[in-house]
């Protein structure tokens, strides 16, 4: 399929001028190669009326120009002075006329309207409202008022001052009388129909004296806007209808075969399946405007799409509306990542999220989507050491790999989980990505102590089994913080038999910490990676006490009865107001969030010397200070 | 469930060497997943720690009360965990109880989870 895109269908009438942008997939070959714009013949070939070259055909001299903006992908072709002759089958493209790489664009100029004199025209969109004035002498100021559609060779009534009101008008129109003093009265149409368009005369009085005026309405179906984005990107859809539909239901629908447009979302909270996960209606404005935020582009959601007002959230008769066709550009700048991350209960995930590289200074953030009413994305993570309360000590963003991508990690998984979460940045907002994270049965391939508590003084030794399959990954434990997972020294003490069918490849490595003080409370984790790309996590939380006086009895003795494997995690989770994404500039513009960034440091850690009495009696205690 | 079993308690005299074993079954994970401990309690009295042992035994840990007298070790081989106790004194006659960990650590409270029934030690003067 070519990348090149453009508009399929130009309307126009003699005598005006059209402008016609293609867009292409802004590479540096592209950027500098030959553009064209041609005419199909009967028989195939395509002849070239206008080139970046400088070529212009004599058909268009004098009244044609074609521009190249090569920093946004983009070419646009000018031409005046049209004439019906200049109809039929064009092709924008790139390189050589034969080569494919091309749109093809319909031009379809039509013959102005043949008017009669005194003829006011009324030029109105699709939806909107159009008010027709029609003045009239004083000897007819008291009598009948009437406004006629011309249908073929006769006028049909559409309203008058006696009540009438033709079906086909009903609940959308009024006929206004002005005060005494105006000699005018008007005709007010709401919620235009393309059906409405035609020839109109308003009359007042219905004898020889009576003043007649002619109305020409043009009701404009809206040209779509032409949007041009990547496979796996994002698009925003800004919908603007105007303040006289700020109440009324907002939908976005995509059209299907014929006039059908199936809702892709709306204020109703209608979300279609396919957009699950991936869609945000963004609050309406004061002044009725909205946008829509898809990810995850697929190729099947190039195509038309159109936003617009009605009370049933869908589109009907008589709707405003805005219009865009999208081309998802298969050639993407954006790279495969998986779009499913499946982890198993108490586990781990670690989710690869790109970036625009250029943008590497900018903020990175995760949040989670939810559906609920018209969709929004609390965030969850930044990359400036904000990590929503509720997950503390299990979620991590990473800087690593760099290049292009960041790495968020959360561990601890429960169903609850399960779900789709947003990659983004305060950057490009077209690199925004979806994964969606499936809660699987299984067991955990780390295997960690449950809750830990480290005496004041002392030294704790916490283990983490890692099976076999992870013999050819670097294991490593670190402290968190909402900055990240700082690395502490650990120690493999050779083979774990935590593991059934597991030979010596499978590993125990211990962190020890050495003469625990208060801030070597927190979570720990143990994990795996490869390089810079993280695996499976496992989270331990330490509490530290004060030692016991001599003789008093250890809590931890009570709980004899504990299986070995429970996990008890800190619940004392403090709730916060959300920081949800609900309009994409937001992270253009502020952060409103204060800085919880984690001060505390000087956690201990050590390598244990593995001497048999180590601490019963020898002084050798090892201090890392970070 | 981890089932720990003690062996080798009986009478001795003062000043006599015994040796104490736990033998671990039914795990939920490997004996080397435990770090291992020893506890004791004399009639009258509370249950007191005695030493303790990490998991691949490359720490240890004794009350001062037992210290250069006793040595912890295991076999992670054969899931054993033994104590062995020299220069026994009168103040010794206790029951002496075996207990598991998931983590070690070094002072005189181990997170214990899961106990022994118990072997009796008497050291007669």
């Known amino acids: 399929k070519s990348p090149i895109f453009g508009p399929e269908e130009v309307n126009s009438v003699e005598g005006n001028s059209v402008s016609i942008t293609c867009y292409y997939p802004p590479t540096s070959v592209n950027r500098h190669t030959r553009k064209y714009w041609c005419r199909q013949g009967a028989r195939g070939g395509c002849i070239t009326l206008i080139s970046s070259e400088g070529y212009v055909s004599s058909k268009y001299a004098g009244r044609a120009n074609l521009t190249n903006f090569p920093e946004n992908g983009t070419f646009v072709v000018n031409i005046a002075q049209l004439s019906q002759d200049d109809s039929g089958r064009y092709k924008c493209g790139l390189g050589i006329n034969s080569r494919g790489l091309s749109f093809d664009v319909s031009l379809e100029v039509s013959q102005g309207p043949g008017l009669l004199n005194d003829t006011k025209v009324y030029t109105v969109d699709l939806g909107r409202t159009v008010t027709i004035n029609c003045p009239f002498k004083t000897e007819n100021a008291q009598k009948r008022k009437s406004l006629y559609k011309q249908i073929g060779l006769y006028p049909v009534l559409v309203i008058d001052s006696s009540g009438y009101v033709n079906p086909n008008y009903t609940g959308r129109i009024r006929l206004d009388i002005q005060g005494t003093g105006q000699l005018l009265f008007s005709v007010v149409i709401n919620q235009l129909r393309l059906s409405d368009a035609g020839q109109y005369l308003c009359q007042a009085g219905d004898d020889s004296n009576s003043n007649k005026k002619n109305a020409d309405l043009q009701v404009l179906k809206p040209e779509p806007e032409l949007v041009y984005e990547d496979l796996r990107g994002s698009v925003t859809f800004h919908c603007a209808l105007g303040p006289e539909v700020a109440n009324v239901a907002k939908f976005l629908c995509r059209q299907s075969s014929g006039e059908n447009c199936d809702v892709v979302v709306n204020t109703l909270g209608k979300r279609a399946p396919a957009f699950e996960g991936r869609i945000l209606l963004n609050p309406q404005d004061k002044d009725g405007s909205f946008s829509v935020v898809i990810t995850g582009l697929r190729k099947e959601d190039a195509g038309r799409y159109l936003c617009g007002a009605h009370s049933d959230g869908q589109l009907q008769e008589g709707s405003p509306i805005q219009a865009w066709q999208l081309f998802v550009n298969e050639e993407s700048t954006i790279p495969r990542s998986p779009t499913v991350v499946k982890g198993v209960a108490g586990s781990s995930v670690a989710v690869l999220c790109p970036y625009n590289r250029k943008e590497s200074k900018s903020i990175k953030y995760w949040c989670l989507w939810e559906g609920a009413q018209n969709g929004r994305c609390p965030l969850l993570v930044d990359s400036e050491g904000w990590v929503k309360a509720q997950y503390e000590g299990r979620l991590s963003l990473l800087e690593e790999p760099g290049n292009g991508t960041f790495t968020v990690i959360l561990n601890q998984l429960t169903s609850r989980d399960a779900g789709f979460y947003w990659c983004l940045t305060n950057g490009d907002t077209l690199w925004r990505t979806t994964v969606e994270i499936k809660i699987i049965e299984g067991e955990p391939n780390l295997k960690v102590p449950g809750n830990v508590t480290a005496v004041l003084g002392e030294t704790l030794k916490v283990p983490c089994h890692f099976p076999c399959k992870f013999s050819s990954y670097e294991k490593y434990w670190c402290k968190w913080n909402n900055t990240g997972c700082q690395a502490l020294p650990s120690q493999d003490e050779g083979p774990s038999k935590a593991f059934v069918n597991c030979d010596e490849n499978s590993r125990l490595v211990s962190l020890t910490l050495n003469l625990v003080t208060r801030a070597d409370e927190g979570w720990y984790w143990c994990g795996v990676k490869q390089g810079h790309f993280y695996g499976e996590t496992a989270a331990v939380y330490v509490a530290v006490e004060e030692r016991k006086a001599a003789g008093s009895r250890d809590v931890s003795l009570a709980k004899a009865d504990a299986a070995p494997d429970e996990k008890v995690l800190d619940s004392g989770f403090r709730e916060i107001e959300n920081k949800a994404i609900q309009d994409p500039r937001l992270f253009a513009e502020e952060k409103a969030v204060a800085d919880t960034r984690d001060q505390a440091d000087g956690s201990r850690a050590s390598v244990d010397s593995g001497s048999s009495e180590e601490q019963g009696g020898s002084s050798r205690h090892h201090h890392h200070h970070h | 469930q981890v089932q720990l079993v003690e062996s080798g308690g009986g009478l001795v005299q003062a000043g006599d060497s015994l040796r104490l074993s736990c033998a671990a079954s039914?795990?939920?994970?490997?004996?080397?997943?435990?770090?291992m401990a020893w506890f004791r309690q004399a009639p009258g009295k509370e249950r007191e720690f005695v030493a303790s042992i990490t998991y691949n035994g490359g720490s240890t840990y004794y009350a001062d009360s037992v210290k250069g007298r006793f040595t912890v070790t295991r076999d992670n081989g054969k899931d054993t965990v033994t104590l062995r106790m020299n220069s026994l004194k009168p103040d010794d006659t206790a029951v002496y109880y075996c207990a598991s960990a998931q983590y070690w650590r070094s002072g005189t409270s181990f997170p214990a989870n899961y106990w022994g029934q118990g072997t009796l030690v008497t050291v007669s003067s």
């Open positions: 039914g795990r939920a994970l490997s004996f080397n997943t435990y770090a």
